[in-house]
């Protein structure tokens, strides 16, 4: 048993039929010595008396909010949560496996630049009675500071008959140098509590591997005289690391017809302009990627050809 | 990256072209190692990230762009010095870049070159003949060193009398390639920055 936060404890249980469970001793936080009674979840049934209560925690029926009272007055509470381990594997009932980039991916993280700021998000089909807390560090044996905000509900989506909820959190490495070569990964740990169930999820990554630039900005077309060609120009996104001559991007320019089946013309360039043929009803899109370290491409920025 | 790229003319700055070749060569070699050694721990998640140049060179600090010198987190061990004597910067007046930066890059290349050559000698003794270092990558390291044109003592190639442990050698190859790729990215960024200066 360990303390998650004040008056909230997690009991780790091997989950199999007729498992013996864990013996837990609860102590009432009071100077009083006698006349103390215990209840679970404010029911009228008295579980025991005395300053300590010994319970065998085997299942969810044994978890909950234990309260010690004296003469009708509440003295203290202890909330017991369960963390289930089945066949040596901790349960992952609360979050949805996003299966990207591989199976058992519950947390996904992205950074728009090398500033040490990143966002992580996760999905669940649970709508209420749910709390998350997020911690992060650089490395685990001698951890360096990363500060994370509160997790917030960032999106709701309908998937078939079911609703899916996306939560996200922003974190910032306390002393990050954009030019640094990372040798220790960032560790992100999410504690999830749904009613009486506790689970934890972790992700480990280098900022360089989760880089996804914002789309190029100010995408513009300039028709070339007496030609079907146009000059496409754009700029580095505002959120990208500077100086741009050090943190350089490479770009992919795509000409796409109205129909998805039409052949796409693609050009790759390190410059912030390109000359392409603009077909009627087509659109021109540009996306960006770190020039030297191939992490994710940005989303497309697009303009119509007309 | 295996994509058609319209690369700009390296122009006045020959090292930029060489550093781009270096990054391409080490990335290809790392990809080849990952594929060939698929049953070895060779991915970024599986390996220990070691830097053989740690405490010996200070490339990141020495080659820091001017704009980042205001960032306290980047200034842990920054040393300053002035104008370079390397040929890459011949006829270029620049207050940003010091000899220390390019000589630090040169020292990195020299250290990796020695390690790779020693490792290749061991891999050539492997009866499985599973993987060898790409000669193109070794040649590109050499070309960039020549372009940097620094004179420094030659480091003798390490020779080992004991029977090599080929499993350990292959894991060490993965570790080296990962670290060298990261350093090659830094070198490329630096050269790009210098080229624009």
């Amino acid at each position: 048993i360990w303390e998650l936060k004040k008056d909230v404890y997690v009991v780790e249980l091997d989950w199999y039929p007729d498992a013996p469970g864990e013996m837990v001793v609860l102590t009432c936080d009071t100077p009083e010595e006698d006349g103390i009674t215990w209840t679970l979840d404010q029911s009228s049934e008295v579980l025991g008396s005395g300053k300590t209560l010994t319970i065998q925690v085997k299942e969810f029926g044994d978890a909950g909010q234990y309260t010690c009272h004296k003469g009708g007055e509440v003295l203290s509470h202890s909330l017991l949560l369960l963390h289930k381990k089945e066949d040596g594997i901790w349960s992952t009932d609360i979050l949805k496996d996003q299966k990207e980039p591989k199976n058992k991916t519950f947390l996904r993280c992205e950074a728009k630049n090398y500033s040490g700021r990143f966002t992580c998000w996760w999905l669940t089909t649970i709508s209420t009675d749910l709390t998350f807390s997020v911690k992060s560090s650089r490395g685990s044996s001698d951890p360096q500071g990363v500060t994370c905000g509160a997790a917030t509900l960032s999106a709701e989506r309908v998937r078939g008959d079911n609703k899916e909820y996306e939560y996200s959190v922003e974190c910032q490495e306390d002393s990050a140098c954009p030019a640094a070569e990372e040798s220790l990964p960032i560790e992100v740990m999410v504690d999830a509590v749904h009613k009486l169930k506790y689970e934890n999820y972790t992700s480990s990554f280098f900022i360089r591997d989760i880089i996804k630039p914002d789309p190029p900005k100010n995408l513009q077309l300039k028709p070339l005289k007496n030609s079907r060609q146009v000059e496409v120009s754009w700029e580095y996104p505002d959120t990208w690391s500077t100086p741009h001559s050090y943190f350089s991007l490479t770009f992919c320019v795509q000409v796409q017809g109205k129909s998805k089946r039409e052949k796409k013309d693609r050009v790759f360039t390190d410059k912030t302009s390109a000359t392409v043929i603009c077909r009627k009803n087509a659109s021109i899109s540009v996306r960006a990627q770190d020039r030297y370290y191939s992490s994710s491409w940005s989303e497309w920025a697009s303009v119509p050809c007309s | 990256r295996n994509l058609p790229v319209a690369t700009p003319d390296p122009g006045m700055f020959p090292c930029l072209h060489h550093s781009q070749n270096l990054l391409r060569a080490v990335s290809n070699m790392l990809q080849k190692a990952r594929q060939t050694l698929e049953f070895y721990p060779c991915t970024s998640e599986e390996i220990d990230h070691e830097d053989i140049t740690k405490d010996k060179t200070s490339t990141v600090e020495a080659c820091l762009p001017l704009e980042l010198t205001k960032n306290e987190s980047c200034l842990n061990s920054r040393e300053t010095s002035f104008i370079t004597n390397g040929s890459c910067l011949a006829s270029r007046k620049t207050s940003f870049m010091m000899a220390l930066c390019l000589s630090s890059i040169y020292e990195d290349l020299k250290m990796y070159q020695v390690e790779f050559k020693t490792m290749n000698a061991k891999l050539l003794m492997d009866p499985k003949r599973q993987i060898f270092l790409d000669q193109n990558m070794l040649a590109v390291i050499d070309e960039l060193m020549q372009a940097l044109n620094f004179n420094s003592e030659t480091v003798p190639q390490k020779s080992s009398l004991e029977e090599p442990d080929f499993y350990k050698t292959k894991i060490k190859l993965c570790i080296l390639l990962h670290a060298f790729r990261i350093r090659a990215v830094t070198i490329d960024r630096v050269m790009s920055y210098l080229n624009a200066s």
């Epitope: 979840d41 404010q42 029911s43 009228s44 299942e59 969810f60 029926g61 978890a63 909950g64 909010q65 509440v74 009932d93 089909t125 649970i126 709508s127 209420t128 008959d161 079911n162 609703k163 009613k195 009486l196 169930k197 | -």
Partner: antibody, heavy 117, light 107 residues
Framework: QVQLQQSGAELMKPGASVKISCKAT????????IEWVKQRPGHGLEWIGG????????NYNEKFKGKATFTADSSSNTAYMQLSSLTSEDSAVYYC??????????WGQGTSVTVSS | SIVMTQTPKFLLVSAGDRVTITCKAS??????VAWYQQKPGQSPKLLIY???NRYTGVPDRFTGSGYGTDFTFTITTVQAEDLAVYFC?????????FGGGTKLEIK
Amino acid sequence: QVQLQQSGAELMKPGASVKISCKATGYTFNDYWIEWVKQRPGHGLEWIGGFSHGSGSTNYNEKFKGKATFTADSSSNTAYMQLSSLTSEDSAVYYCARRRFRGMDYWGQGTSVTVSS
Amino acid sequence: SIVMTQTPKFLLVSAGDRVTITCKASQSVSNDVAWYQQKPGQSPKLLIYYASNRYTGVPDRFTGSGYGTDFTFTITTVQAEDLAVYFCQQDYSSPWSFGGGTKLEIK
């Protein structure tokens, strides 16, 4: 002793509104949700929504948004549900129940609402 | 929203019989399922929560099991006072939903 005491039966005209009360005793009102459930003969149990006075959160079944409104008075530990624009479809027994970790563990005795002209 | 399909709708049994009611969720609800008993003219009473945990004071002839989408409620030895309608309910994700109910009648 945990108890949820609901207000008495109501006979209402179509188009009118009704406010049902649910007085909670024997536990800390703020620690639990008060859920509201509708039961019509032959229709089983239908969850309308819930209200947590402790967090100020409401949780509605989409179907009853605009029909039901939840409020509470912490001084008397009483939860209320107002049903507006009543029609014959709203004729039912309405239950309040407390919920936290273990389903709806205590229920009120039910309030019968009949809508008839 | 999650649909709870409960079967059968009716059960006619003799005292002492074993009764099994099943509930199938339209998507995984982990073990967040409760079972209620509603006797004629009364409000529902909680019997089982977290799929298999008996609520305080509930006789041990009432048992529940299941995980994910398939849940079972059993009365091992039916007694005359068990005449009631039984409902399953998921409280994994709102809107909370109930099964259609199973009316248990004693011969």
